[in-house]
Protein backbone atom coordinates (compact mmCIF):
# COMPACT_ATOMS: atom_id res chain seq x y z
CA UNK A 1 0.00 0.00 0.00
CA UNK A 2 1.43 3.33 -1.06
CA UNK A 3 0.48 6.92 -1.17
CA UNK A 4 -1.19 7.92 -5.16
CA UNK A 5 1.06 8.67 -7.89
CA UNK A 6 0.86 11.98 -9.18
CA UNK A 7 -2.05 13.20 -11.25
CA UNK A 8 -1.93 15.09 -14.69
CA UNK A 9 -4.50 17.97 -15.95
CA UNK A 10 -4.14 16.65 -19.43
CA UNK A 11 -6.71 19.10 -21.29
CA UNK A 12 -8.45 21.98 -20.74
CA UNK A 13 -11.43 22.99 -23.42
CA UNK A 14 -14.50 25.30 -23.55
CA UNK A 15 -17.36 25.17 -26.08
CA UNK A 16 -18.21 29.40 -26.18
CA UNK A 17 -15.37 31.25 -23.96
CA UNK A 18 -18.71 31.47 -21.16
CA UNK A 19 -17.81 28.05 -19.59
CA UNK A 20 -15.01 25.49 -19.72
CA UNK A 21 -14.01 21.92 -17.97
CA UNK A 22 -10.69 20.67 -17.02
CA UNK A 23 -10.01 16.69 -16.98
CA UNK A 24 -7.04 14.91 -15.32
CA UNK A 25 -5.92 11.71 -15.42
CA UNK A 26 -5.07 9.74 -12.09
CA UNK A 27 -2.08 8.37 -11.36
CA UNK A 28 -1.03 5.00 -9.74
CA UNK A 29 -4.12 4.52 -6.67
CA UNK A 30 -1.54 3.23 -4.52
CA UNK A 31 -3.87 -0.02 -3.72
CA UNK A 32 -6.24 2.21 -1.88
CA UNK A 33 -9.32 4.36 -2.44
CA UNK A 34 -8.22 8.08 -3.70
CA UNK A 35 -9.86 10.95 -3.49
CA UNK A 36 -9.28 14.03 -5.98
CA UNK A 37 -9.47 17.72 -5.37
CA UNK A 38 -8.75 20.57 -8.28
CA UNK A 39 -7.96 23.80 -6.31
CA UNK A 40 -7.40 26.80 -8.55
CA UNK A 41 -6.23 30.84 -7.96
CA UNK A 42 -6.91 33.06 -10.78
CA UNK A 43 -3.35 35.19 -11.33
CA UNK A 44 -2.53 37.50 -9.54
CA UNK A 45 -5.00 36.21 -6.78
CA UNK A 46 -3.82 34.83 -3.24
CA UNK A 47 -6.85 32.86 -2.78
CA UNK A 48 -7.30 29.28 -3.46
CA UNK A 49 -10.63 27.98 -4.17
CA UNK A 50 -11.83 24.54 -5.11
CA UNK A 51 -13.39 23.47 -8.32
CA UNK A 52 -17.26 24.34 -8.06
CA UNK A 53 -18.58 21.46 -10.04
CA UNK A 54 -17.04 18.25 -10.51
CA UNK A 55 -19.93 16.35 -11.66
CA UNK A 56 -21.31 18.27 -15.54
CA UNK A 57 -17.96 17.05 -16.99
CA UNK A 58 -17.86 13.42 -16.20
CA UNK A 59 -15.45 11.60 -14.23
CA UNK A 60 -12.09 13.57 -13.30
CA UNK A 61 -13.54 16.62 -14.41
CA UNK A 62 -13.67 20.34 -13.02
CA UNK A 63 -16.70 22.43 -14.52
CA UNK A 64 -16.39 25.68 -14.47
CA UNK A 65 -19.87 27.51 -15.00
CA UNK A 66 -20.93 31.16 -16.45
CA UNK A 67 -19.97 32.33 -12.51
CA UNK A 68 -16.11 31.07 -12.70
CA UNK A 69 -15.20 31.87 -16.05
CA UNK A 70 -13.44 34.96 -16.61
CA UNK A 71 -11.73 36.27 -20.03
CA UNK A 72 -8.25 37.65 -20.14
CA UNK A 73 -7.82 36.06 -16.69
CA UNK A 74 -5.47 33.05 -16.70
CA UNK A 75 -6.20 30.07 -13.94
CA UNK A 76 -3.93 28.35 -12.31
CA UNK A 77 -5.02 24.89 -11.12
CA UNK A 78 -3.19 21.63 -9.72
CA UNK A 79 -5.21 18.51 -8.76
CA UNK A 80 -4.70 16.54 -4.94
CA UNK A 81 -4.99 12.68 -4.56
CA UNK A 82 -4.84 11.79 -1.57
CA UNK A 83 -5.30 8.29 -0.05
CA UNK A 84 -4.32 6.72 3.69
CA UNK A 85 -0.91 6.56 2.91
CA UNK A 86 -0.42 10.37 1.76
CA UNK A 87 -0.83 12.85 -0.99
CA UNK A 88 0.38 13.80 -4.29
CA UNK A 89 0.12 16.60 -6.86
CA UNK A 90 0.13 17.12 -10.31
CA UNK A 91 1.82 20.34 -12.09
CA UNK A 92 0.62 23.47 -11.83
CA UNK A 93 -1.18 24.15 -15.01
CA UNK A 94 -2.20 27.45 -16.31
CA UNK A 95 -5.38 27.88 -18.45
CA UNK A 96 -6.28 31.18 -20.52
CA UNK A 97 -9.90 30.21 -21.42
CA UNK A 98 -9.17 32.27 -24.93
CA UNK A 99 -7.22 29.34 -25.88
CA UNK A 100 -8.72 26.43 -24.75
CA UNK A 101 -12.11 27.12 -26.84
CA UNK A 102 -13.21 23.81 -28.95
CA UNK A 103 -16.69 24.89 -30.56
CA UNK A 104 -19.38 22.58 -31.24
CA UNK A 105 -19.59 22.18 -35.14
CA UNK A 106 -21.18 24.09 -37.40
CA UNK A 107 -24.70 23.88 -37.94
CA UNK A 108 -27.20 22.97 -40.62
CA UNK A 109 -25.08 22.24 -43.57
CA UNK A 110 -27.45 21.88 -46.80
CA UNK A 111 -25.76 21.32 -49.76
CA UNK A 112 -27.10 22.00 -53.61
CA UNK A 113 -26.10 21.72 -56.86
CA UNK A 114 -26.69 24.59 -59.04
CA UNK A 115 -26.80 24.70 -62.91
CA UNK A 116 -27.21 28.35 -64.13
CA UNK A 117 -27.46 28.87 -67.94
CA UNK A 118 -25.11 31.27 -68.41
CA UNK A 119 -22.46 29.93 -66.02
CA UNK A 120 -21.31 26.37 -65.44
CA UNK A 121 -22.71 24.11 -62.49
CA UNK A 122 -21.44 24.23 -59.39
CA UNK A 123 -22.13 22.74 -55.88
CA UNK A 124 -22.92 25.43 -53.04
CA UNK A 125 -22.90 24.73 -49.25
CA UNK A 126 -24.41 26.48 -46.81
CA UNK A 127 -24.04 26.29 -42.64
CA UNK A 128 -24.50 28.23 -39.60
CA UNK A 129 -22.58 28.76 -36.86
CA UNK A 130 -23.01 26.75 -33.80
CA UNK A 131 -25.84 28.14 -31.10
CA UNK A 132 -23.55 28.16 -27.98
CA UNK A 133 -21.47 30.95 -30.26
CA UNK A 134 -22.87 34.49 -29.95
CA UNK A 135 -21.15 36.16 -32.85
CA UNK A 136 -22.90 39.06 -32.49
CA UNK A 137 -20.67 40.24 -29.34
CA UNK A 138 -17.42 40.40 -31.94
CA UNK A 139 -15.65 38.31 -28.85
CA UNK A 140 -15.17 35.80 -31.68
CA UNK A 141 -14.24 35.21 -34.85
CA UNK A 142 -14.97 31.93 -36.28
CA UNK A 143 -13.25 30.38 -39.45
CA UNK A 144 -14.59 27.36 -41.34
CA UNK A 145 -13.44 24.48 -43.40
CA UNK A 146 -14.91 22.28 -45.54
CA UNK A 147 -13.82 18.32 -46.81
CA UNK A 148 -15.67 16.05 -49.48
CA UNK A 149 -14.98 13.19 -50.93
CA UNK A 150 -17.35 10.98 -53.24
CA UNK A 151 -18.40 8.29 -51.30
CA UNK A 152 -15.98 5.18 -51.93
CA UNK A 153 -13.09 7.26 -52.16
CA UNK A 154 -10.34 7.20 -49.10
CA UNK A 155 -9.18 10.60 -49.33
CA UNK A 156 -10.96 13.93 -48.56
CA UNK A 157 -10.69 17.42 -50.98
CA UNK A 158 -10.49 20.29 -47.97
CA UNK A 159 -10.94 24.14 -48.37
CA UNK A 160 -10.87 26.70 -46.49
CA UNK A 161 -13.67 29.52 -46.41
CA UNK A 162 -12.65 31.80 -43.91
CA UNK A 163 -15.09 33.79 -42.22
CA UNK A 164 -17.96 32.86 -44.82
CA UNK A 165 -20.53 30.27 -44.08
CA UNK A 166 -21.29 29.28 -47.75
CA UNK A 167 -19.15 28.30 -50.54
CA UNK A 168 -18.85 26.71 -54.02
CA UNK A 169 -17.07 24.29 -55.53
CA UNK A 170 -16.50 23.75 -59.12
CA UNK A 171 -14.32 20.89 -59.72
CA UNK A 172 -16.74 17.49 -58.93
CA UNK A 173 -16.56 14.34 -60.82
CA UNK A 174 -20.51 14.15 -62.27
CA UNK A 175 -22.11 10.96 -61.73
CA UNK A 176 -20.95 10.51 -58.28
CA UNK A 177 -22.51 10.55 -54.39
CA UNK A 178 -20.30 13.24 -52.35
CA UNK A 179 -19.67 12.98 -48.70
CA UNK A 180 -19.49 16.73 -47.70
CA UNK A 181 -19.13 17.82 -44.37
CA UNK A 182 -17.75 21.42 -42.59
CA UNK A 183 -16.20 22.30 -39.27
CA UNK A 184 -15.09 25.63 -37.09
CA UNK A 185 -12.55 27.03 -35.64
CA UNK A 186 -12.12 30.37 -33.14
CA UNK A 187 -9.16 32.65 -34.25
CA UNK A 188 -7.93 31.27 -31.35
CA UNK A 189 -8.26 27.61 -30.34
CA UNK A 190 -9.37 24.32 -31.73
CA UNK A 191 -10.98 22.98 -34.45
CA UNK A 192 -14.48 21.93 -33.74
CA UNK A 193 -15.30 17.95 -34.61
CA UNK A 194 -16.59 17.90 -38.23
CA UNK A 195 -20.22 18.08 -38.79
CA UNK A 196 -22.43 15.00 -39.78
CA UNK A 197 -22.25 14.21 -43.36
CA UNK A 198 -24.78 15.63 -45.47
CA UNK A 199 -24.84 13.39 -49.21
CA UNK A 200 -25.39 15.11 -52.55
CA UNK A 201 -25.72 13.00 -55.78
CA UNK A 202 -23.86 14.97 -58.74
CA UNK A 203 -25.58 14.53 -61.97
CA UNK A 204 -24.44 12.94 -64.96
CA UNK A 205 -25.01 15.39 -66.76
CA UNK A 206 -22.58 17.98 -64.80
CA UNK A 207 -19.71 19.78 -66.25
CA UNK A 208 -16.39 19.67 -65.67
CA UNK A 209 -14.28 23.19 -64.77
CA UNK A 210 -11.61 23.39 -67.12
CA UNK B 1 -35.55 45.64 -9.44
CA UNK B 2 -32.32 44.08 -8.21
CA UNK B 3 -32.17 44.33 -4.54
CA UNK B 4 -31.05 42.76 -0.82
CA UNK B 5 -32.85 43.39 2.27
CA UNK B 6 -31.32 42.50 5.81
CA UNK B 7 -32.81 41.26 8.62
CA UNK B 8 -32.32 39.98 12.30
CA UNK B 9 -30.53 43.18 13.69
CA UNK B 10 -31.12 44.48 17.27
CA UNK B 11 -29.73 44.82 20.60
CA UNK B 12 -27.87 42.35 22.57
CA UNK B 13 -25.78 42.24 25.36
CA UNK B 14 -22.06 40.80 25.14
CA UNK B 15 -21.58 36.78 25.16
CA UNK B 16 -24.85 36.67 23.42
CA UNK B 17 -26.09 35.69 19.87
CA UNK B 18 -27.89 36.77 16.74
CA UNK B 19 -28.65 35.57 13.72
CA UNK B 20 -28.70 38.02 10.63
CA UNK B 21 -30.99 36.82 7.50
CA UNK B 22 -30.53 38.32 4.17
CA UNK B 23 -32.69 37.94 0.86
CA UNK B 24 -32.33 38.60 -2.43
CA UNK B 25 -34.75 39.30 -5.75
CA UNK B 26 -34.51 40.68 -9.10
CA UNK B 27 -31.28 38.38 -9.91
CA UNK B 28 -29.98 34.88 -9.92
CA UNK B 29 -29.00 34.35 -6.61
CA UNK B 30 -26.89 31.34 -7.24
CA UNK B 31 -24.66 33.40 -9.67
CA UNK B 32 -22.86 35.38 -7.09
CA UNK B 33 -20.66 35.32 -4.70
CA UNK B 34 -22.03 36.67 -1.42
CA UNK B 35 -20.76 38.42 1.37
CA UNK B 36 -21.15 40.65 5.05
CA UNK B 37 -19.84 43.61 5.11
CA UNK B 38 -20.05 45.86 8.25
CA UNK B 39 -19.71 49.50 9.16
CA UNK B 40 -19.48 50.46 12.70
CA UNK B 41 -20.73 54.13 13.63
CA UNK B 42 -18.68 56.75 12.59
CA UNK B 43 -16.18 54.19 10.73
CA UNK B 44 -15.23 53.04 7.85
CA UNK B 45 -15.99 49.29 5.48
CA UNK B 46 -15.15 46.37 6.73
CA UNK B 47 -15.37 42.43 5.27
CA UNK B 48 -16.58 40.01 7.71
CA UNK B 49 -17.01 36.90 5.68
CA UNK B 50 -18.33 35.49 2.63
CA UNK B 51 -18.38 32.86 0.40
CA UNK B 52 -18.64 31.47 -3.48
CA UNK B 53 -22.06 30.73 -5.30
CA UNK B 54 -21.87 27.41 -4.63
CA UNK B 55 -21.13 27.69 -1.12
CA UNK B 56 -17.87 26.44 -0.77
CA UNK B 57 -15.14 27.06 1.17
CA UNK B 58 -16.11 29.76 3.66
CA UNK B 59 -13.94 32.78 4.59
CA UNK B 60 -14.02 35.13 7.47
CA UNK B 61 -12.00 38.43 8.38
CA UNK B 62 -9.74 37.29 11.63
CA UNK B 63 -11.67 39.60 14.24
CA UNK B 64 -14.92 37.02 13.63
CA UNK B 65 -13.03 33.87 13.49
CA UNK B 66 -14.77 31.14 15.50
CA UNK B 67 -17.78 33.42 16.44
CA UNK B 68 -19.45 33.90 13.10
CA UNK B 69 -20.67 31.55 10.85
CA UNK B 70 -21.85 32.55 7.20
CA UNK B 71 -24.85 30.37 5.56
CA UNK B 72 -26.69 30.56 2.49
CA UNK B 73 -29.53 28.91 0.96
CA UNK B 74 -29.60 29.04 -3.03
CA UNK B 75 -33.28 28.03 -2.98
CA UNK B 76 -34.61 30.50 -1.12
CA UNK B 77 -32.45 33.41 -2.10
CA UNK B 78 -31.20 33.70 1.24
CA UNK B 79 -27.66 34.55 2.76
CA UNK B 80 -27.49 34.11 6.79
CA UNK B 81 -24.98 34.85 9.49
CA UNK B 82 -24.93 33.05 12.75
CA UNK B 83 -23.02 35.61 15.40
CA UNK B 84 -22.36 34.07 18.74
CA UNK B 85 -19.83 35.47 21.41
CA UNK B 86 -20.64 39.51 20.46
CA UNK B 87 -18.80 42.06 21.55
CA UNK B 88 -18.52 45.74 22.08
CA UNK B 89 -16.32 46.09 18.92
CA UNK B 90 -19.32 44.40 16.42
CA UNK B 91 -21.17 46.63 17.01
CA UNK B 92 -22.53 48.15 13.87
CA UNK B 93 -24.50 48.43 10.41
CA UNK B 94 -24.50 45.05 8.74
CA UNK B 95 -24.45 44.98 4.90
CA UNK B 96 -25.56 42.01 3.09
CA UNK B 97 -23.36 42.24 -0.31
CA UNK B 98 -23.47 40.65 -3.56
CA UNK B 99 -20.08 40.13 -5.89
CA UNK B 100 -20.21 40.66 -9.34
CA UNK B 101 -19.50 37.29 -10.30
CA UNK B 102 -19.69 33.50 -8.57
CA UNK B 103 -16.64 34.55 -6.30
CA UNK B 104 -17.08 35.87 -3.31
CA UNK B 105 -14.19 38.03 -3.63
CA UNK B 106 -15.15 40.18 -6.34
CA UNK B 107 -16.23 44.05 -6.40
CA UNK B 108 -19.30 43.98 -4.72
CA UNK B 109 -22.03 45.76 -6.76
CA UNK B 110 -24.95 45.31 -5.12
CA UNK B 111 -25.74 46.44 -1.20
CA UNK B 112 -28.45 46.11 0.58
CA UNK B 113 -29.66 49.31 3.29
CA UNK B 114 -27.87 47.35 6.38
CA UNK B 115 -29.60 46.15 9.73
CA UNK B 116 -27.98 47.41 12.94
CA UNK B 117 -26.23 45.47 15.59
CA UNK B 118 -25.75 46.81 18.79
CA UNK B 119 -24.03 45.18 21.63
CA UNK B 120 -24.30 46.73 25.07
CA UNK B 121 -24.82 46.12 28.30
CA UNK C 1 -3.62 41.18 5.06
CA UNK C 2 -3.30 43.32 2.43
CA UNK C 3 -3.73 46.89 4.20
CA UNK C 4 -5.03 49.73 1.95
CA UNK C 5 -3.95 53.17 2.87
CA UNK C 6 -6.28 56.30 1.39
CA UNK C 7 -4.91 59.93 1.00
CA UNK C 8 -5.40 62.64 1.37
CA UNK C 9 -7.97 62.11 4.38
CA UNK C 10 -10.18 64.96 3.21
CA UNK C 11 -10.26 66.64 0.43
CA UNK C 12 -11.56 70.19 -0.22
CA UNK C 13 -13.02 70.91 -3.40
CA UNK C 14 -15.13 73.24 -5.17
CA UNK C 15 -18.21 71.54 -7.70
CA UNK C 16 -17.17 72.07 -11.17
CA UNK C 17 -13.54 70.87 -10.07
CA UNK C 18 -11.14 67.91 -10.71
CA UNK C 19 -10.74 65.27 -7.51
CA UNK C 20 -7.37 63.24 -7.40
CA UNK C 21 -7.58 60.10 -5.05
CA UNK C 22 -5.00 57.73 -3.96
CA UNK C 23 -4.73 54.07 -2.37
CA UNK C 24 -1.52 52.86 -1.92
CA UNK C 25 -1.28 48.98 -0.78
CA UNK C 26 0.73 47.31 1.47
CA UNK C 27 1.95 44.76 -1.50
CA UNK C 28 1.23 44.74 -5.08
CA UNK C 29 -1.51 44.02 -6.21
CA UNK C 30 -2.60 42.84 -9.54
CA UNK C 31 -4.76 45.25 -10.86
CA UNK C 32 -8.15 43.02 -11.45
CA UNK C 33 -8.34 43.43 -8.08
CA UNK C 34 -9.11 46.68 -7.21
CA UNK C 35 -12.16 48.55 -6.81
CA UNK C 36 -13.45 52.10 -5.84
CA UNK C 37 -16.73 53.19 -3.71
CA UNK C 38 -18.94 56.12 -3.37
CA UNK C 39 -20.71 56.73 0.09
CA UNK C 40 -22.86 59.78 0.13
CA UNK C 41 -24.22 60.57 3.71
CA UNK C 42 -26.96 58.39 4.83
CA UNK C 43 -26.50 56.05 2.19
CA UNK C 44 -25.25 52.46 1.52
CA UNK C 45 -21.87 52.45 -0.23
CA UNK C 46 -21.63 52.09 -4.66
CA UNK C 47 -19.62 50.49 -6.58
CA UNK C 48 -17.69 53.18 -9.09
CA UNK C 49 -14.70 51.15 -10.84
CA UNK C 50 -13.45 47.45 -11.03
CA UNK C 51 -10.49 46.16 -12.14
CA UNK C 52 -8.52 49.28 -11.17
CA UNK C 53 -10.86 50.79 -14.14
CA UNK C 54 -13.28 49.74 -15.51
CA UNK C 55 -16.51 51.63 -14.56
CA UNK C 56 -19.77 49.97 -13.07
CA UNK C 57 -22.99 49.84 -14.85
CA UNK C 58 -24.42 53.44 -14.97
CA UNK C 59 -21.13 55.33 -13.90
CA UNK C 60 -20.99 58.42 -15.84
CA UNK C 61 -17.69 59.19 -17.45
CA UNK C 62 -16.35 61.60 -15.16
CA UNK C 63 -14.89 59.23 -13.07
CA UNK C 64 -11.93 56.94 -14.38
CA UNK C 65 -9.73 54.49 -12.53
CA UNK C 66 -5.59 54.01 -12.67
CA UNK C 67 -3.09 52.84 -11.36
CA UNK C 68 -0.60 49.60 -10.83
CA UNK C 69 1.50 47.94 -8.46
CA UNK C 70 1.05 49.50 -5.18
CA UNK C 71 -0.27 52.97 -5.99
CA UNK C 72 -4.20 53.51 -7.67
CA UNK C 73 -5.98 56.56 -8.22
CA UNK C 74 -9.27 57.43 -8.62
CA UNK C 75 -10.10 60.72 -10.50
CA UNK C 76 -12.85 62.85 -10.80
CA UNK C 77 -13.32 65.10 -13.49
CA UNK C 78 -15.93 67.78 -12.87
CA UNK C 79 -17.22 67.27 -9.16
CA UNK C 80 -21.24 67.25 -9.08
CA UNK C 81 -23.17 67.86 -5.89
CA UNK C 82 -23.43 64.54 -4.96
CA UNK C 83 -19.68 63.68 -5.29
CA UNK C 84 -18.92 65.18 -2.17
CA UNK C 85 -19.10 61.85 -0.06
CA UNK C 86 -16.35 59.20 1.15
CA UNK C 87 -14.63 57.59 -1.41
CA UNK C 88 -12.93 53.72 -0.04
CA UNK C 89 -10.98 52.08 -2.38
CA UNK C 90 -11.12 48.24 -1.87
CA UNK C 91 -8.54 44.62 -2.81
CA UNK C 92 -10.18 41.54 -3.38
CA UNK C 93 -7.30 39.90 -4.76
CA UNK C 94 -7.11 38.52 -1.30
CA UNK C 95 -9.58 38.14 1.53
CA UNK C 96 -11.17 41.48 0.98
CA UNK C 97 -10.25 45.02 2.78
CA UNK C 98 -11.09 48.59 2.62
CA UNK C 99 -8.85 51.90 2.69
CA UNK C 100 -9.96 54.21 5.49
CA UNK C 101 -11.49 56.69 3.40
CA UNK C 102 -11.29 59.91 1.33
CA UNK C 103 -13.63 62.55 2.67
CA UNK C 104 -14.64 65.12 -0.29
CA UNK C 105 -16.11 67.84 0.95
CA UNK C 106 -17.21 71.54 -0.18
CA UNK C 107 -14.77 74.64 0.17
Known amino acids: QLPPGKPEIFKCRSPNKETFTCWWRPGTDGGLPTNYSLTYHREGETLMHECPDYITGGPNSCHFGKQYTSMWRTYVMMVNATNQMGSSFSDELYVDVTYIVQPDPPLELTVEVKQPEDRKPYLWMKWSPPTLIDLKTGWFTLLYEIRLKPEKAAEWETHFAGQQTEFKILSLHPGQKYLVQVRCKPDHGYWSAWSPATFIQIPSDFIMND | EVQLVESGGGVVRPGGSLRLSCVGSGFSFDDHGMNWVRQGPGKGLEWVSGFNWNGGSTNYAESVKGRFTISRDNARNSLFLQMNSLRAEDTALYYC??????????????WGPGTMVTVSS | EIVLTQSPGTLSLSPGERATLSCRAS???????LAWYRQKPGQTPRLLIYGTSSRATGIPDRFSGSGSGTDFSLTISRLEPEDFAVFYCQQYAGLPTFGPGTKVDIK
Open chain 3, 27 to 33: QTINSNY
Open chain 2, 97 to 110: VRGRSGWFNDAFDV
